[in-house]
Amino acid sequence: ESLGWDIAELQLNHTGPQQDPRLYWQGGPALGRSFLRGPELDKGQLRIRRDGIYMVHIQVTLAICSSTSTSRHHHPTTLAVGICSPASRSISLLRLSFHQGCTIASQRLTPLARGDTLCTNLTGTLLPSRNTDETFFGVQWVRP
Amino acid sequence: ESLGWDIAELQLNHTGPQQDPRLYWQGGPALGRSFLRGPELDKGQLRIRRDGIYMVHIQVTLAICSSTSTSRHHHPTTLAVGICSPASRSISLLRLSFHQGCTIASQRLTPLARGDTLCTNLTGTLLPSRNTDETFFGVQWVRP
Amino acid sequence: ESLGWDIAELQLNHTGPQQDPRLYWQGGPALGRSFLRGPELDKGQLRIRRDGIYMVHIQVTLAICSSTSTSRHHHPTTLAVGICSPASRSISLLRLSFHQGCTIASQRLTPLARGDTLCTNLTGTLLPSRNTDETFFGVQWVRP
């Protein structure tokens, strides 16, 4: 682990209570193909333990969704990945809207520091799929 | 190669016969910008030769497609990437539907073992594009 | 840097003049979370400085966009990432259309050589968002 190969791939555990837009994640071989090797989970949110540049990737699929599902609901459904703590480093890293689709997927390189906690906020009123091949979130340390 | 930097990027060769939803891939410098360095192809399917955590990525674009093409066809067009053999390890790793779009693209981290064969199943009745900048599939070993 | 860990993540600076479909990028810590460590910018286009296989990724979101924006405009909005110079190596690497969506995001592995300049061409008449969490472009050296 001294090489700094920190890596994690998480699956959706549950959504937050009504006023909390965060998705809550879980990981570990017992759950399927998710894992944490370096980063850790703090109440379902991913915390970074090693400084560096990371590849952050995410896919979120809406539950029992058709191309008309997203247009039925007034508030646009948007997914944002960001650093939510510490507050001094709070920033949105990656943002996507579903529009008339049922899945968003993207990835980006970003510098992260030890102690950064990443939040994935799903705004709107549509429930995400918990299928492990449809909704997942991960990070990979790529260089110092 | 002893470092375990196994990597492959493939281009679409052809679709399967009518009852076979699998996409058949090809790779090699003579074909364009595709390549196999470690993993190998077995009858158009990608076989892993080194244990580890891999970044799997895919983009599939439907041929001569407009936003109405996908909605015209009753059966939803879905792309699933999974381990199809050995049967004991069969699992869906990544799944996306086209809905009203013409392209899906995603990526995920997943543990793979030597001998795992990855299949990319395209269900529905729409033909994928064979353009090498529109449809491609790849894996990258990232850590043990 | 001798390890060959060349990496860059860029944010949109501006679009080109009317007949120039290229997006012009910028990077550096002073601008936000973008950076260049190895590759360099030449008049807003990304130039590779080390041979190898790279993971290229991009996300582009259209400005003030709704699912009807893209269907309102006759000419399809398409994003293509390619090598634009030297001319002898000119090729399209990755191409996506927006159809009824407002964001495209994808990634691929591709061999690049020192001196290759990557261009990102956005065809159509819709303006891309300059928000750093909505539009970004990056490369990561992954192996020789």
Partner: antibody, heavy 120, light 111 residues
Framework: EVQLKQSGPGLVQPSQSLSITCTVS????????VHWVRQSPGKGLEWLGV???????DYNAAFISRLSISKDNSKSQVFFKMNSLQADDTAIYYC??????????????WGQGTSVTVSS | DIVLTQSPASLAVSLGQRATISCRAS??????????MHWYQQKPGQPPKLLIY???NLESGVPARFSGSGSGTDFTLNIHPVEEEDAATYYC?????????FGAGTKLELK
């Protein structure tokens, strides 16, 4: 406090139409969908349709030809209209709020119901 | 349409005992990692009241003696210990696809 209050006639002539208004309070129709369900001794609970926050409607295919659901967000009112009623449409008609998640299709608050008898 | 079959049609349970109600769907109502089955309670002269959603999630304000389980096509509502105020008719409802359908109901009486 979330409330749904229904108003409408108790008696409808055969082949005539039924109109019910559901006035809501404690939540906004620009955020939540409203379902219509009826209950009769013979057929139990039957889902009729829903109007979403956007004004888009989904109807039970069995009623689509004679059912219309609309709303006025500013008045917090949802309007239900069913045409060509027959005796077997005699039932209690309910409006009910869709829960927070739009794709969950579950009803967390219900109106008091409107008892409708179809008879000449 | 998905048909929901509830059993038994009625049952009588002593105070403090367990009541178990079953709901079987004509096809799976599980999708996207959830079980799209919900349970309501209805007392005479009142509208239905949501008890449990997504097979096992207790609606806010509902006592913990109510619990739900199941997946695919077979679902169960348990009430333990049964209290006097639990005398009512209980309905299952799926939301896997349109149209939404309900079970015919199970009437719970106290011995």
């Amino acid at each position: 406090e979330v409330q749904l209050k229904q108003s409408g006639p108790g008696l409808v002539q055969p082949s005539q139409s039924l109109s019910i208004t559901c006035t809501v309070s404690g939540f906004s129709l620009t955020t939540y969908g409203v379902h219509w369900v009826r209950q009769s001794p013979g057929k139990g609970l039957e889902w009729l349709g829903v109007i979403w926050s956007t004004g888009i409607t989904d109807y039970n295919a069995a009623f689509i030809s004679r059912l219309s659901i609309s709303k006025d967000n500013s008045k917090s009112q949802v309007f239900f209209k069913m045409n060509s009623l027959q005796a077997d449409d005699t039932a209690i008609y309910y409006c009910a709020r869709n829960s927070y998640y739009g794709n969950l299709y579950v009803m967390d608050y219900w109106g008091q119901g409107t008892s409708v008898t179809v008879s000449s | 349409d998905i048909v929901l079959t509830q059993s038994p049609a009625s049952l009588a349970v002593s105070l403090g005992q367990r009541a178990t109600i079953s709901c079987r769907a004509s096809k799976s109502v599980s999708a996207s990692g959830y079980n799209f089955m919900h349970w309501y309670q209805q007392k005479p002269g009142q509208p239905p009241k949501l008890l449990i959603y997504l097979a096992s999630n207790l609606e806010s304000g509902v006592p913990a003696r109510f619990s739900g389980s199941g997946s695919g096509t077979d679902f169960t509502l348990n009430i333990h210990p049964v209290e006097e105020e639990d005398a009512a008719t209980y309905y299952c409802q799926h939301s896997r696809e349109l149209p939404l359908t309900f079970g015919a109901g199970t009437k719970l009486e106290l011995k």
